[in-house]
């Protein structure tokens, strides 16, 4: 279900590129290519290259990204490009100036003095932003989302972007100061992962993170199940970062038993996060459960 040809404008192209990047990453990390044949990996990489090349058409002189060249650049979309490209660095040749230029723009143009990242040009395709949609804890959720992207680009861009460590610290300070007031499980999960990556999810914050889990196995808000899959995937990544391997198995089983294999309208974030989290689990967890995820690799016909 996951190998698709990216196409369309700056947002649609990322929607199309997401499942292919995450499928290749998942199968690489879990060493499962022999099930499908290595020639399929090559075909998938070609599609990622195509998506990458097409995305460059929507890169603005400022290094930010937007749906269209003449549209104001989006904080969220630029951060998402950073996130996907950071993962794709190990798969295809990506110009570090493209990636780190976007990082620099996020920090210099979109981060406020209090550490918050602001959005001045929301994406058109709101379905692609997952649980951030209609989120009444927008400052926390968006700041966490951008912070996670920055942390994933840190190794690649630290030398090119001097302000990156300071920006990460500032955003972390904001999340930490406001974490205890969060109401939504989604925001608790995404901000929890951002803080866990920094080693700052501890004490009362860690307690809040863990006790927000429903039945100790999922981070759930009323509404779309897709958002709960996405939130629980962030939470699983946080647990793995914390090396809390006792809490992990029921979370993994819940995600696995949702039988969520990606694809479909509005699935961009859930797809990316569930496969990223389960790949990390199979890599990190001692004595991990072998997961039988239905990753279908039907390459599009030429």
């Amino acid at each position: 279900h996951l190998i698709v040809t990216p196409s369309g404008a700056g947002e649609q192209n990322m929607i199309g590129m997401t499942p292919t990047v995450i499928a290749v990453h998942y199968l690489d990390e879990t060493e499962q290519w022999e099930k499908f044949g290595l020639e399929k990996r090559q075909g998938a990489l070609e599609l990622i290259k195509k998506g990458y090349t097409q995305q460059l058409a929507f890169r603005q002189p400022s290094s930010a990204f937007a749906a269209f060249v003449k549209r104001a650049p989006s904080t969220w979309l630029t951060a998402y490009v950073v996130k996907v490209f950071s993962l794709a660095v190990n798969l295809i040749a990506i110009d570090s100036q493209v990636l780190c230029g976007a990082v620099k723009w996020l920090i210099l143009e979109k981060q406020k003095p209090d550490g918050v990242f602001q959005e001045d040009a929301p994406v058109i395709h709101q379905e692609m932003i997952g649980g951030l949609r209609n989120n009444n804890e927008k400052d926390m959720a968006l700041t966490a989302f951008v912070l996670i992207s920055l942390q994933e680009a840190k190794d690649i861009c630290e030398e090119q972007v001097n302000s990156l460590p300071g920006s990460i610290t500032k955003a972390g300070d904001f999340l930490e100061a406001n974490y205890m007031n969060l109401q939504r499980s989604y925001t608790v999960a995404i901000a929890g992962y951002a803080l866990a990556q920094m080693g700052r999810l501890k004490g009362p914050l860690l307690n809040k993170f863990l006790t927000t889990a429903k039945d100790k196995n999922r981070w759930e808000d009323p509404g779309k199940q897709l958002y709960n899959v996405e939130a629980t995937s962030y939470a699983l990544l946080a647990l793995l970062q914390l090396k809390d391997f006792d809490f992990v198995p029921p979370v993994v089983r819940w995600l696995n038993e949702q039988r969520y294999y990606g694809g479909g309208y509005g699935s961009t974030q859930a797809t990316f996060m569930v496969f990223q989290a389960l790949a990390q689990y199979q890599k990190d967890a001692p004595d991990h459960q072998e997961l039988n995820l239905d990753v279908s690799l039907q390459l599009p016909s030429r």
Partner: antibody, heavy 120, light 108 residues
């Protein structure tokens, strides 16, 4: 925290039956609940469980014939259809230990059980 | 369905002695295993969860351990009140979960 099952009785084969588990001292909006049965003189048999949001999980043998549902913040039902003499047993409900997945964190506490007898 | 094979079916021990009960899983279930004690006419009682964690209020003479797919419940310094039937519950997946057949423990 305590649990009590009710609804067990003598029924003829093919008759449907609903058992109810009533909890006190806690709310099912924050707890999981499992059902287990035990035929006279035999071992325990896992049926399934329901999470705090109402999602259900069943043993493969129980799928289709058994339905677990939350009827209020203090009651959970077990609906059984197409009963046979093989279903004669004491039926127990048990909460997930510390509000977690009962298959991982264990089941505690348990109700005293209710006896269902299927006979013609 | 044979998820869990429990041995022995019955055993006896003197007061102060040790009882060992084993459950063999048909495949890897990691820490998805709990142990229960049941006395005649009573519901089961949780002893151990996550293969080795002692449930609240359970005496420390009960110990759960694991080696690969073999799980062990050991009762050291057995007391008269430990006479009961013991069951393991193992879970491969939510729909592939079963109790062992039980072990009847008699205290001499």
């Amino acid at each position: 925290q305590s649990l009590e099952e009710s609804g067990g009785r003598l029924v003829t084969p093919g008759t449907p039956l609903t058992l109810t588990c009533t909890v006190s001292g806690f709310s099912l909006s924050r707890y999981t609940m499992a059902w287990v049965r035990q035929a006279p003189g035999k071992g325990l048999e896992y049926i399934g469980w329901i999470d705090s949001s109402g999602s259900t999980y069943y043993a493969s043998w129980a799928k289709g014939r058994f339905t677990i549902s939350k009827t209020s913040s203090t009651t959970v039902d077990l609906k059984m259809t197409s009963l046979t003499t093989e279903d004669t047993a004491t039926y127990f409900c048990a909460s997930g230990n510390d509000g977690g997945d009962p298959l991982y964190y264990g089941m505690d506490p348990w109700g005293p059980g209710t006896l269902v007898t299927v006979s013609s | 369905d044979g998820v869990m094979t429990q041995t022995p079916s019955s055993t006896s021990a003197a007061v102060g002695g040790t009882v060992t009960i084993k459950c063999q899983a048909s495949q890897s279930i990691r820490s998805w295993l709990s142990w229960y004690q049941q006395k005649p006419g009573q519901p089961p009682k949780l002893l151990i969860y996550e293969a080795s964690k002692l449930a609240s209020g359970v005496p420390s003479r009960f110990k759960g351990s694991r080696s690969g797919t073999e799980y062990t419940l050991a009762i050291s310094g057995v007391q008269r009140e430990d006479a009961a039937t013991y069951y393991c519950l193992g879970s491969i997946a939510s729909d592939d979960t079963a109790f062992g057949a039980g072990t009847n423990v008699e205290i001499k």
